[in-house]
Amino acid sequence: APRGTQAEESPFVGNPGNITGARGLTGTLRCQLQVQGEPPEVHWLRDGQILELADSTQTQVPLGEDEQDDWIVVSQLRITSLQLSDTGQYQCLVFLGHQTFVSQPGYVGLEGLPYFLEEPEDRTVAANTPFNLSCQAQGPPEPVDLLWLQDAVPLATAPGHGPQRSLHVPGLNKTSSFSCEAHNAKGVTTSRTATITVLPQQPRNLHLVSRQPTELEVAWTPGLSGIYPLTHCTLQAVLSDDGMGIQAGEPDPPEEPLTSQASVPPHQLRLGSLHPHTPYHIRVACTSSQGPSSWTHWLPVETPEGVPLGPPENISATRNGSQAFVHWQEPRAPLQGTLLGYRLAYQGQDTPEVLMDIGLRQEVTLELQGDGSVSNLTVCVAAYTAAGDGPWSLPVPLEAWRPGQAQPVHQLVKEPSTPAFSWPWW
């Protein structure tokens, strides 16, 4: 107690007792003092620190008629639902002016069945994959020994003999339950039962089998699934986000994926209705009665180019004397790739067909030799990509140009003389 000028006698005439019990117990500590005059406020200390939020009540009883007479002051501290944090040394404290007095200590202890600080948690694991479970318990009284159980069967001969806080499981092939028992001198407490659900392993070796402009055939190797056969596999494809890309470990695609289910076996699937000449990312997961495996990493794939699906549009062919003007527009149908150019074919009645590569221009002027009196001259045009030619247009007859008729404005092109652009009967 703080130094004073008088060896003052402590005003305390009753000190806190001791409480020892199991968790959840409710108890009361009590101290009593006798003072002359105005009674002071009684405070409670735990391990030497004032309890700011103590659940305490103070009762004051005068022992005489005069306020200068003695008072009996009783302070009671209620401990509800005893916890480990409540344990320690308890004292009462009063301030009499600048002097401080503390009572003799009482002790609160905890003793009962073990109490779990950590219990095994439900989780999912891939078949035949190692994992750990945790369990931690404390008294008092100590020591606390643990015994692990798998599907209600003890994993050691006696508590404390097997694994303690952490149980290493090398792998499971079926969904199992785990719990742990905590043993101390007071008895046994059993933890919650954790269900460990065995899911299929992640599929491996996802790869491309064949490619077509609008479909991809993919295959994979299934992972182990324990005693549970696979029911199906799910494949997801998503358009690659230009510039963004799906990184190998990225959890979600940038947009809603195209999802397909495959019956298994075989572990193969044809993905149709895709865009030609387009990068995709694909991944696969397989499911058993216990649930789905984790997804594979995203695999980048690409559909090949295809040929244009339609001919060029709005072809017009007119002729004015020894010149023929032909022009057209890009096909409306999908190109299925990068347009590389156009091919033009023309033919007269009873004459062989002549083919020309026009490049990416959409018009051409042909310089005809002779008087151009050949009859029934027709022109066809086709677009092409790196994958080949698209369909040819229907033959368009070369019409004579009439004054007032619009004529395309373009650079006059004289076709090269080799091969000579001439009709043998002219």
């Epitope: 703080p2 130094r3 004073g4 000028t5 003072v35 002359q36 005059g37 105005e38 406020e41 405070h43 200390l45 030497g48 620190q49 004032i50 306020e67 200068q68 404290l93 301030f95 009499l96 002016g97 600048h98 002097q99 401080t100």
Partner: antibody
Amino acid sequence: QVQLQQPGAELVKPGASVKLSCKASGYTFTSKWMNWVKQRPGQGLEWIGEINPSNGRTNHNEKFKSKATLTVDKSSSTAYMQFSSLTSEDSAVYYCARSGYGKYYSAMDYWGQGTSVTVSS
Amino acid sequence: DIVLTQSPASLAVSLGQRATISCRASESVDNYGISFMNWFQQKAGQPPKLLIYAASNQGSGVPARFRGSGSGTDFSLNIHPVEEDDTAMYFCQQSKEVPPTFGGGTTLEIK
């Protein structure tokens, strides 16, 4: 409001005694301890002692134990300090100060204006 | 007795700036989880006025410009921003043990 009234000055001869008074108002006199503090000109503060007006209980600074006697008159809500065997060292301003309780302990929250004691022949 | 040493003995601070006064105790003034340290202001010809109790709690009617901090043996009083009216003597005081003791005081002058 809380007030502690003290006489302004006392002139006393060496070897004599002086009884300083402090009249309290504005609160229940018996509910708070009363302190006495000494301050010499241009110097620090020294705590002399305190008294519980409800029962007369006192706590003293050992240095002043034989010099200062603390008493109260509850009927007039007045605290007294008798200072004996005065010497020039006892020339100082003497304050009474009430102990107001913070949540857990006393702090001197209200002070009188002080009495200037001059010891001179 | 517990000895309290204040520093500096005096300081001059410009209006609106921060003033910091330190107080060191010869032994810890903490007990029961409380720091038994108070701060007082004394203007010329007046009694001391309680500014801070229990190291950091403001006394009744004390402006928020006055802040106390610290624990154990080292404590400080901060005044920010200082005002003309803050010219005074400042004392720390411990009330952990009998007798309560005071620091030697710090004179604050406003420039």
